[in-house]
Interface confidence: low
């Protein structure tokens, strides 16, 4: 994975929240849910009320990157999805408000959002080769690809 030092000179400025209260389903149609107080997992749900609802905030890069850079917040909370290292669970970081500017090691809060048809991918800005992923019998984590599932469907208007 790419070291933080490659990215430390890039500054990301918060623009606005671009999506509210959406659900993320992986390619096996498993929804992301709260495993416990600090991290997430995926499960096939009969009732989508149990799924985690996310908000997505957009950031603009000082590098004028063509990629869409986003932060993921659990709706109605002050918990933000934070990347660690490869095969490590993504964590939920508590912050009083959405960061106005992000740079350096704080880029573990940011993801490049890419869409291919109905498939959505979230690549860690801190680790550009790694994606938010689900893995059997494990937390939602960062992974480079199979056997982890890295593509998600966004289900909106579930509130």
């Amino acid at each position: 994975s790419a070291p933080f030092s490659f990215l430390s000179n890039v500054k990301y400025n918060f623009m606005r929240i671009i999506k509210y209260e959406f659900i993320l389903n992986d390619a096996l149609n498993q929804s992301i849910i709260r495993a416990n107080d600090q991290y997430l997992t995926a499960a096939a749900l009969h009732n989508l009320d149990e799924a985690v609802k996310f908000d997505m905030g957009a950031y603009k890069s000082s590098k004028d990157d063509a990629k869409i850079t986003v932060i993921l917040r659990i709706s109605k909370t002050q918990l933000y999805v934070t990347a660690q290292d490869e095969d490590q669970p993504v964590l939920l970081k508590e912050m009083p408000e959405i960061p106005k500017t992000i740079t350096g090691s704080e880029t573990n809060l940011l993801f490049f959002w890419e869409t291919h048809g109905t498939k959505n991918y979230f690549t860690s800005v801190a680790h550009p080769n790694l994606f938010i992923a689900t893995k059997q019998d494990y937390w939602v984590c960062l992974a480079g690809g199979p056997p982890s599932i890295t593509d998600f469907q966004i289900l909106e208007n579930q509130a």
């Epitope: 709260r34 495993a35 416990n36 107080d37 600090q38 991290y39 985690v52 609802k53 659990i74 709706s75 109605k76 909370t77 002050q78 918990l79 660690q84 669970p89 964590l91 970081k93 508590e94 009083p96």
Partner: antibody
Framework: QIQLVQSGPELKKPGETVKISCKAS????????MNWVKQAPGKDLKRMAW????????TYADDFKGRFAFSLETSASTAYLQINNLKNEDTATYFC???????????????WGQGTSVTVSS | NIQMTQTTSSLSASLGDRVTISCRAS??????LNWYQQKPDGTVKLLIY???RLHSGVPSRFSGSGSGTDYSLTISNLEQEDIATYFC?????????FGGGTKLEIN
């Protein structure tokens, strides 16, 4: 059953340092954040900080930045609160409390330690 | 920051009484309201979370209600062991403030 057991009462002089422990049992320590809450005599309960028991990272309330340090010994399922350069106004009972989000968004503290009384007096 | 107010700081009642303790938030907290009991020996327990849900092991004589900014805790049949101070707390936004507490005493 779930228990949080704190260290005993402390009597300190101004300028000294105190370190309080909170040992958790009955659940997976790294799955839940830990709070520290202050209750000064005759005052409200006040949440001082939340510590992520997976990373050890703390989020401090505004009034508790500077002289306060929160740490973990994960292998022993223990959280610590250290207060440096003690002042008279630090006289209080300090509680550790496990944090939990109900329904994904409503925060509560579902299990509490018995409290540790700290008295600062010259 | 959201402020929590418990206007009644102490309350006197008789065993067997129905007692209601109220709590007001300075803005809408969307039912993210918890109640805690602090016994005279200092021990604190969560009684009710998310306005009306009983925490495990809490007797059914305790109940909670409310919405928006106004919430209440009711003890339907007061027992000696309920003598304590009761605190509300909002769980909606940091720093998750507590109310000042209501001390419940026996007549």
């Amino acid at each position: 059953q779930i228990q949080l057991v704190q260290s005993g009462p402390e009597l300190k002089k101004p300028g000294e340092t105190v370190k309080i422990s909170c040992k958790a049992s009955g659940y997976t320590f790294r799955n839940y954040g830990m709070n520290w809450v202050k209750q000064a005599p005759g005052k409200d309960l006040k949440r001082m900080a939340w510590i992520n028991t997976y990373t050890g990272e703390s989020t401090y309330a505004d009034d508790f930045k500077g002289r306060f340090a929160f740490s973990l010994e994960t292998s022993a399922s223990t959280a610590y609160l250290q207060i440096n350069n003690l002042k008279n106004e630090d006289t209080a009972t300090y509680f550790c409390a496990r944090g939990i989000y109900y329904y994904g968004s409503s925060y509560a503290m579902d299990y509490w330690g018995q409290g540790t009384s700290v008295t600062v007096s010259s | 920051n959201i402020q929590m107010t418990q206007t009644t700081s102490s309350l006197s009642a008789s065993l067997g009484d129905r007692v209601t303790i109220s709590c007001r938030a300075s803005q809408d907290i969307s039912n993210c309201l918890n109640w805690y009991q602090q016994k005279p020996d200092g021990t604190v327990k969560l009684l009710i979370y998310y306005t009306s849900r009983l925490h495990s092991g809490v007797p059914s004589r305790f109940s909670g209600s409310g919405s928006g900014t106004d919430y209440s805790l009711t003890i339907s049949n007061l027992e000696q062991e309920d003598i304590a101070t009761y605190f509300c707390q909002q769980g909606k936004t940091l720093p998750y403030a507590f109310g000042g507490g209501t001390k419940l005493e026996i007549n």
